[in-house]
């Protein structure tokens, strides 16, 4: 991760003291089940959850160095329908593979301005950011 | 949301200027598909994704006022196996309903101390926090 300037530092405080990114060793924030190679519409009998699912998905990286987390991953469904539990390799049109969305809290860095309008380092702006977490096998909606 | 003290404020800066929580109107951070009432092991034909899934789940609130986000939701599977696509109510033992986990970036507030050890407001400490996002229908692992 690139090191961001301090969060509007006050005199004599190093930015590390103000907003400690690195208190916990932080690996790249990719899902444990990240697998870019499983691109076929099948449910594997081993491997990570996204490849064993009957609504399998892959992950797509979304990197923004002015955002925290800088790396987010979006799920992308590999099949329109669910894969049969009998074989794991042919589709069952009675089920749809649908994306599960979530509004995640993220922070964007932007310039902080003092009372006189002068630049005073960076502030963090909290935002909700829509990410797709996974693909889920659902029964199709019955329209009333 | 309760208002947190500033991120180690420098003289003359209001905390709102330093770390703007409220730039975007922020509703409670609950998933769009939140449903505490769907506690039966069945796949509905309407309603939110977590109740239409053949691996249905409910959400459990995890609130911590010293963390951002203060409210997180953990998925809890309602069935050990997947629900049949045919009936939406019988279980199909050929599929397991498994939790999908994710290490989410969160921030904890804690006292900031100056060089002389005196209290200087609050700092944010970045952490990874394990949350369960959803339940996914998977084919059981084949042991080699």
């Amino acid at each position: 991760y690139s090191h961001w300037p301090s969060c509007c530092p006050s005199k004599g405080y190093p930015s590390e003291e103000l907003l400690r990114w690195s208190t916990v060793p932080v690996p790249p924030l990719k899902p444990a089940s990240l697998d870019f190679h499983s691109v076929s519409c099948r449910a594997s009998e081993d491997g990570p959850l996204n490849s064993r699912a009957i609504s399998p998905w892959r992950y797509e990286l979304d990197r923004d160095l002015n955002r925290l987390p800088q790396d987010l991953y979006h799920a992308r469904c590999l099949c329109p329908h669910c894969v049969s539990l009998q074989t794991g390799s042919h589709m069952d049109p009675r089920g749809n593979s649908e994306l599960l969305y979530h509004n995640q809290t993220v922070f964007y860095r932007r310039p902080c301005h003092g009372k006189k309008g002068n630049h005073k380092g960076y502030c963090l702006e909290r935002r909700l950011y829509r990410v797709s977490l996974a693909c889920v096998c659902v029964r199709p909606r019955v329209m009333g | 949301y309760s208002h947190w003290p500033s991120c180690c404020p420098s003289k003359g800066y209001p905390s709102e200027e330093l770390l703007r929580w409220s730039t975007v109107p922020v509703p409670p951070l609950k998933p769009a598909s939140l449903d505490f009432h769907s506690v039966s092991c069945r796949a509905s034909e309407d309603g939110p994704l977590n109740s239409r899934a053949i691996s249905p789940w409910r959400y459990e609130l995890d609130r911590d006022l010293n963390r951002l986000p203060q409210d997180l939701y953990h998925a809890r599977c309602l069935c050990p196996h997947c629900v049949s696509l045919q009936t939406g109510s019988h279980m199909d033992p050929r599929g397991n309903s498994e939790l999908l986990y994710h290490n989410q970036t969160v921030f904890y507030r804690r006292p900031c101390h100056g060089k002389k050890g005196n209290h200087k407001g609050y700092c944010l400490e970045r952490r990874l926090y394990r949350v369960s996002l959803a339940c996914v229908c998977v084919r059981p692992r084949v042991m080699g």
Partner: antibody, heavy 123, light 113 residues
Framework: QVQLQESGPGLVKSSETLSLTCTVS????????WSWIRQPPGKGLEWIGF???????NYNPSLKSRVTFSVDTSKNHFSLKLNSVTATDTAVYYC?????????????????WGQGTLVTVSS | DIVMTQSPDSLAVSLGERATINCKSS????????????LTWYQQKPGQPPKLLIY???IRESGVPDRFSGSGSGTDFTLTISSLQAEDVALYFC?????????FGPGTKVDIK
Amino acid sequence: QVQLQESGPGLVKSSETLSLTCTVSGGSISSYYWSWIRQPPGKGLEWIGFIYYSGSTNYNPSLKSRVTFSVDTSKNHFSLKLNSVTATDTAVYYCARHYFDSGTYELGPFDYWGQGTLVTVSS
Amino acid sequence: DIVMTQSPDSLAVSLGERATINCKSSQNILLTSSNKNYLTWYQQKPGQPPKLLIYWASIRESGVPDRFSGSGSGTDFTLTISSLQAEDVALYFCQQYYITPFTFGPGTKVDIK
């Protein structure tokens, strides 16, 4: 009436690749699932895997690392390749069609079989 | 994998008598949502490929004589030949198609006593 016919060499050297083709007549290869099954002399049946006309495959985990299926819809045939063969791969190899249940969207039993071809692996 | 076992390994029955073959699966192959047992029976005569007799545990394939019947549910299944004929001398296999890999029983040899 659907008929299946296996073809390929009856003798394969150890460590080499066994190659067989199944030709379907009296019906289209499309819209069905097609399997390979083998039977060592005097023994039981072992399912090797299936292929769909689209090329989607499913292999028995016990043979997955050595087996490859392919399909040619224009010639109405599908093929099996089994590499690094040993004497234990000596068997009668059958191709067969899966019954498909359109109500459950699942594969049923094997309703049509080829006559089978004996493949012997020699050292 | 689901393991299929058959008993007996072989049996000899007089012409016109009943022959019973048992098949057991290592796990349940009944799907409650459809109330179907994913089990089939095949007959194999020497030098020939297997021939489909029974599917969904009890449904007779068209053209199969009605002396052949299948029964059972869950993990225990039976093929019955109510009145054995000379042409019924063969090897009989059960097979599950509940989940891949599809697996066969070892076979039961039926002879005339």
